[in-house]
Interface confidence: low
């Protein structure tokens, strides 16, 4: 163990730009201060002298999601009988670099609505709100990523297991299906241009069958049909 109390395992946990830095160890002997900066700026302190091992840095990283950020965790003795106070140069450890636009995970999408009319199935994905602000309002996921953001629809006849896929760079799918057949489907957010963290988890599965539709209504889950 590091007797200086230096933090370790600094890890960025970020989904749809909600961004938290986590580290170890949880210690009764030390408290921590987190500092964050871009390559061009001075360090800014956050989460002063906290006993926690996480710090929410969302407010800092959403200022410019295209910037690359680095954080560091400074360690201080929790109880210090020394009258000189805290050390001037406390031990610290740097985080990996973090570029929100490239590194935030895509959250699980939600199917906002769907409608099957004849041989057409229309599925709309809810445009998730992020914590990125422009002109005082929170931007949607698509407003941040633009056409970098695609959605993939996985769909299959309720009576079979063979999945088909469709892709859109809007939030809507309009696909051809067999008339009179019930279909189930889920969606996944995708940023094809990324080298990593390209895909979100899949959404919950929805189905067009009346029986399942009634079951959802009984549990208070309503869909807005176009």
């Amino acid at each position: 163990a590091d007797t200086t109390g230096r933090a370790y395992n600094l890890t960025w946990k970020s989904t749809n730009f909600k961004t938290i830095l986590e580290w170890e160890p949880k210690s009764i002997d030390h408290v921590y201060t987190v500092q964050i900066s871009t390559r061009l700026e001075n360090w800014k302190s956050k989460c002063f002298l906290t006993a926690e091992t996480e710090c929410d840095l969302t407010d800092e990283v959403v200022k410019d999601v295209g910037q690359t950020y680095m954080a560091r965790v400074l360690s201080y003795p929790a109880r210090n009988g020394n009258t000189t106070g805290f050390p001037e140069e406390p031990p610290f450890r740097n985080s990996p670099e973090f570029t929100p636009y490239l590194d935030t995970n895509l959250g699980q999408p939600t199917i906002q609505s769907f409608e099957q009319v004849g041989t057409k199935l229309n599925v709309t994905v809810q445009d998730a709100r992020t914590l990125v602000r422009r002109n005082g309002t929170f931007l949607s996921l698509r407003a941040v990523f633009g056409k970098d953001l695609n959605y993939t629809l996985y769909y299959w006849r309720a009576s079979s297991t063979g999945k088909k896929t469709a892709t859109t760079n809007t939030n809507e799918f309009l696909i051809d299906v067999d008339k009179g057949e019930n279909y189930c489907f889920s969606v996944q957010a995708v940023i094809p241009s990324r080298k990593r963290k390209q895909r979100s988890p899949e959404s919950l599965t929805e189905c067009t069958s009346r029986e399942q539709g009634r079951a959802r209504e009984m549990t208070g889950h309503h869909h807005h049909h176009h």
Epitope: D64, V65, G66, Y101, L102, D127, V132, R134, L139, S140, R142, A143, V144, F145, G146, K147, D148, T170, N171, I191, P192, S193, R194
Partner: antibody, heavy 124, light 108 residues
């Protein structure tokens, strides 16, 4: 107020490579797409292609084999290269910002900020 | 490729008159991705209308957009001297994004 300032060589010989750069002032590259459009003398507008801040591109298929659009986020600028030019590539070349706008669930794209244009002439 | 055909090619009108410009698409275009631009000689195009109906920031309310599917219209309710220019429709929903050939609104 976001402004686009563009520059590059204005006179080329056939078979040379056209190279233009567009710098973004007063705003970030991220969250937008960045386009190149051209306009031959006395004619209409033709979309060449676009790039996102992360480097993903879309090109006009009619030019795809000759076009490269790149982005340099550290300099807040993006560039166009068009190889093997001919007289048919003589045009005013514009850079533009392709903005996503969301209102009550509707998503829209439009080119709301344009560079002033660079006149490129291809002549032997 | 979606071909946008604008008509008429030239519109000769007097200040104060109403101008109606048409943009017809070779296949259906989502109104979300249909925009109109104004261009004056020696200048870059200027965004007027996005999403087929919404006026861009700073555009006077005499400009309005309408239509859906394959037929879209830009209307200038009362022409002002500064409105005489070339107008382009554009679709940005399907690659390659395309512009119409333009309608020139000239002083009669």
């Amino acid at each position: 107020q976001v402004q686009l300032q563009q520059w590059g060589a204005g006179l080329l010989k056939p078979s040379e490579t056209l190279s233009l750069t567009c710098a973004v002032y007063g705003g970030s590259l991220s969250g937008y797409y960045w386009s190149w459009i051209r306009q031959p003398p006395g004619k209409g507008l033709e979309w060449i292609g676009e790039i996102g801040a992360s480097g993903s591109t879309r090109y006009n298929p009619s030019l795809k084999s000759r076009v490269t659009i790149s982005v340099d986020t550290s300099k807040n600028q993006f560039s166009l290269k068009l190889s093997s030019v001919t007289a048919a590539d003589t045009a005013v070349y514009y850079c533009a910002r392709d903005t996503p706008y969301y209102y009550e669930g509707g998503y829209y794209y439009y080119m709301d900020v344009w560079g002033k244009g660079t006149t490129v002439t291809v002549s032997s | 490729e979606i071909v946008l055909t604008q008509s008429p090619g030239t519109l000769s009108l007097s200040p104060g008159e109403r101008a109606t410009l048409s943009c017809r698409a070779s296949q259906s275009v989502s109104s979300s991705f249909l925009a109109w631009y104004q261009q004056k000689p020696g200048q870059a195009p200027r965004l007027l209308i996005y999403g087929a109906y919404s006026r861009a920031t700073g555009i006077p309310d005499r400009f309005s957009g309408s239509g859906s599917g394959t037929d879209f219209t830009l209307t200038i309710s009362r022409l002002e001297p500064e409105d005489f220019a070339v107008y382009y429709c554009q679709q940005a929903g399907v690659v390659p994004y395309t512009f119409g050939g333009g309608t020139k609104v000239e002083i009669k």
